[in-house]
Amino acid sequence: EDELQVIQPEKSVSVAAGESATLRCAMTSLIPVGPIMWFRGAGAGRELIYNQKEGHFPRVTTVSELTKRNNLDFSISISNITPADAGTYYCVKFRKGSPDDVEFKSGAGTELSVRAKPS
């Protein structure tokens, strides 16, 4: 079995203010077991955008049904984009751990740029 890859295919996504942005991410394997999280930015100051396991993220919807058996698509859509949402988004796979899950592998990142709302 090949080692899991976290595939973020787009390097750049451009969206008009007020629209929704789709950020694509997929895994090539179900192993190891553990959740997916999306972050804006990298390092210690990164901002959690979505956690598959827990939390309330009213502007974020998953593109495919994450509870579906053998689902490998962890793409998300963020609604009502504003200039404050611009940045680089990372899809990150965690390995299930005790007491805490451990970061396993990150995608390459996708730069979200926000265009002015069309007049």
Partner: antibody, heavy 123, light 113 residues
Framework: QVQLVQSGAEVKKPGSSVKVSCKAS????????ISWVRQAPGQGLEWMGS????????NYAQKFQGRVTITADESTSTAYMELSSLRSEDTAVYYC????????????????WGRGTLVTVSS | DIVMTQSPDSLAVSLGERATINCKSS????????????LAWYQQKPGQPPKLLIY???TRESGVPDRFSGSGSGTDFTLTISSLQAEDVAVYYC?????????FGGGTKVEIK
């Protein structure tokens, strides 16, 4: 040795459709990005669209939106490109090409190409 | 869409001399998070599919002779053939893979002077 094997040449009437196939032998087909690129006689390369089988949905160049459909069948490691409402200007060699995914860097370039399928549109 | 502009359209160079091809993108193809430029160069000979020479602007594809090199960042890129050989006669294309559509330049035909 990974190869991309394309279907044979086609002659089509204006207004009809053509469906070209591209079968990958070996490798991890689901994570490839398969692009379709066409080249009219004596002209340059034109990117039409691409699909990553693991996602299932395709991206298309605006010029071809609504006229081209790119699909992939993971069970047979085959990608397809269907172009409808054909006109004489669609006469070209159609190539499928693979981009491989590199961890932490993403897709690099089209590193493997099929030999091309000549589609001739003529009344 | 990102527009890729190549220059010159054609180039005649003596055997053993340097050939330089330029490619300009209408917007940056530099991904700041990893400092990579998503720019590839291809060689196409008559009757053959294109062949990948360079990716990430300056990384040579496996098996490509070291007389081929790529440079540049952001919006301006160069493919250099340091010492032109007879087998290098071909059309050369740049392509950006930063954002879809993954547009190509118009091509540069390299011939022997």
């Amino acid at each position: 040795q990974v190869q991309l094997v394309q279907s044979g040449a086609e002659v089509k009437k204006p207004g009809s459709s053509v469906k070209v196939s591209c079968k990958a032998s070996g490798g991890t087909f689901s994570s490839y990005a398969i692009s379709w690129v066409r080249q009219a006689p004596g002209q340059g390369l034109e990117w039409m669209g691409s699909i990553i089988p693991i996602f299932g949905t395709a991206n298309y160049a605006q010029k071809f939106q609504g006229r081209v459909t790119i699909t992939a069948d993971e069970s047979t490691s085959t990608a397809y490109m269907e172009l409808s409402s054909l006109r004489s200007e669609d006469t070209a060699v159609y190539y499928c090409a693979r981009a491989n995914y590199y961890d932490s860097s993403g897709y690099s370039g089209l590193d493997l190409w099929g030999r091309g399928t000549l589609v001739t549109v003529s009344s | 869409d990102i527009v890729m502009t190549q220059s010159p359209d054609s180039l005649a160079v003596s055997l053993g001399e340097r050939a330089t091809i330029n490619c300009k993108s209408s917007q940056s193809v530099l991904f700041s998070s990893n400092n990579k430029n998503y720019l590839a160069w291809y060689q196409q000979k008559p009757g053959q599919p294109p062949k990948l020479l360079i990716y990430w602007a300056s990384t040579r594809e496996s098996g490509v002779p070291d007389r081929f090199s790529g440079s540049g960042s952001g919006t301006d890129f160069t493919l250099t053939i340091s010492s032109l050989q007879a087998e290098d006669v071909a059309v050369y294309y740049c392509q950006q893979l930063f954002s879809t559509p993954f547009t190509f330049g118009g091509g540069t035909k390299v011939e022997i002077k």
